[in-house]
Interface confidence: medium
C-alpha cells in the first residue's frame, strides 16, 4: 500500500477546521475490516486518531478530530481537525496498514491575521520641529510572529531607532508593539506595516504629525 499526502503544509486559521489529507489506493475487494489507520504526532508519536478492527476508535487528541468514514473504503484516510489552536501546529503522520504498510507526514501550519494597527504618539500635543516623538504601532491577536516595517511619507524605509516586542497571550496568539523614535521635521507621515509571514497579510497603520512653530 502506498500512502500519499500533500507535500505543502496545510495552513489553517485559528478557530477554523482543517483537513489533513491522506490517501491510499485500495486493492479490489478491499474491506474496512482489513484497515489499520493511525494518525499520530510525528515527533512525539502521540496518538491522535485511529481506525482499527473495522471501526473508528475515535479521537485520542482533545476530542477535536474526525475521519471521513464514508470515504475510507475509497482510500480517503484524511483527518479533520476542528477548532484549530496554535498548539496544534506541527507534523502529523498518517500510518496505513492493510497487508503491508506505509506512512507519510503532513505539516500543519497555524495562522491568525493581525488586527489593523493602532497608532499612538508620545508626546501627543505641543509637537515642535526637532522634538523627539515616540510612535507606537500596536497590532493584536496574530500568529505566527509578525514582521514589522516602518516607512516615512515618501515610502522610504525607517530602520533605525525601532524597537519591536511580541508577546504571546494564553492562546499563543501574539500582540505586537513596535516603537519608532523619530525627530519631527516641519511635518511628517509615518506608516507601520504589520505582516503575517504565513498568510502574506499586511495590516497598515499611519499617523501624520504637523509640527507647531518654535518660539524663543
Amino acid at each position: 500500500v502506498e500512502v500519499q499526502v500533500s507535500e505543502d503544509p496545510v495552513v489553517a486559521l485559528v478557530d477554523t477546521d482543517a483537513t489533513l489529507r491522506c490517501s491510499f489506493s485500495p486493492e479490489p475487494g478491499f474491506s474496512l475490516a482489513q484497515l489499520n489507520l493511525i494518525w499520530q504526532l510525528t515527533d512525539t508519536k502521540q496518538l491522535v486518531h485511529s481506525f482499527t478492527e473495522g471501526r473508528d476508535q475515535g479521537s485520542a487528541y482533545s476530542n477535536r478530530t474526525a475521519l471521513f468514514p464514508d470515504l475510507l473504503v475509497q482510500g480517503n484516510a484524511s483527518l479533520r481537525l476542528q477548532r484549530v489552536r496554535v498548539t496544534d501546529e506541527g507534523s502529523y503522520t498518517c500510518f496505513v496498514s492493510i497487508q503491508d504498510f506505509d506512512s507519510a507526514a503532513v505539516s500543519l501550519q497555524v495562522a491568525a491575521p493581525y488586527s489593523k494597527p493602532s497608532m499612538t504618539l508620545e508626546p501627543n500635543k505641543d509637537l515642535r520641529p526637532g522634538n523627539m516623538v515616540t510612535i507606537t504601532c500596536s497590532s493584536y491577536q496574530g500568529y505566527p510572529e509578525a514582521e514589522v516595517f516602518w516607512k516615512d511619507g515618501q515610502g522610504v524605509p525607517l530602520t533605525g531607532n525601532v524597537t519591536t516586542s511580541q508577546m504571546a497571550n494564553e492562546r499563543g496568539l501574539f500582540d505586537v508593539h513596535s516603537v519608532l523614535r523619530v525627530v519631527l521635521g516641519a511635518n511628517g507621515t509615518y506608516s507601520c506595516l504589520v505582516r503575517n509571514p504565513v498568510l502574506q497579510q499586511d495590516a497598515h497603520g499611519s499617523v501624520t504629525i504637523t509640527g507647531q512653530p518654535l518660539t524663543f
Epitope: 515642535r128 526637532g130 522634538n131 523627539m132 533605525g160 531607532n161 523614535r181 525627530v183 518654535l214
Partner: nanobody, 116 residues
Framework: DVQLVESGGGLVQPGGSLRLSCAAS????????MGWFRQAPGKGVEWVST????????YYADSVKGRFTISRDNAKNTLYLQLNNLKTEDTAMYYC?????????RGQGTQVTVSS
C-alpha cells in the same frame, strides 16, 4: 545644571564651510540625543539637525540636507555641526540643545554670517 557652550561661528563667503562645536557639561552627555537649531534675523527658530545618543542616527531639516553634517564625540562631551556649501540664507544664530528646543536645555548660540 546643564551647560552648553557653542563655538566656531564666524563670517564666511557663500560656498564656504564652517565647523560648529558645542561643549556639554552638567549631564551624562552620552545618554542624550542632541540637536542644532538656528534663528535668522527677524525669523522664528528653525530646527536644523538631531543626532541620537550613540551617534548612529542623524536627522536633518530639508533646507540643510546634503550640506550640513551633525556628529558627536561622547568621550569629549562635544557635539559638532559641519556646515558646507553655505548660502546667504544660512545666516543665523546657531544653538545646540539637549534633546529638543526648551528653556534650560540650550546654549547661548554662535553667530554664523554668510556674506560676500
Amino acid at each position: 545644571d546643564v551647560q552648553l557652550v557653542e563655538s566656531g561661528g564666524g563670517l564666511v563667503q557663500p560656498g564656504g564651510s564652517l565647523r560648529l562645536s558645542c561643549a556639554a557639561s552638567g549631564f551624562t552627555f552620552s545618554r542624550y540625543w542632541m540637536g542644532w537649531f538656528r534663528q535668522a534675523p527677524g525669523k522664528g527658530v528653525e530646527w536644523v539637525s538631531t543626532i541620537n545618543s550613540g551617534g548612529g542616527s542623524t536627522y536633518y531639516a530639508d533646507s540643510v540636507k546634503g550640506r550640513f553634517t551633525i556628529s558627536r564625540d561622547n568621550a569629549k562631551n562635544t557635539l559638532y555641526l559641519q556646515l558646507n556649501n553655505l548660502k546667504t540664507e544660512d545666516t543665523a544664530m546657531y544653538y545646540c540643545a539637549k534633546e529638543q528646543w526648551r528653556t534650560g536645555s540650550r546654549g547661548q548660540g554662535t553667530q554664523v554670517t554668510v556674506s560676500s
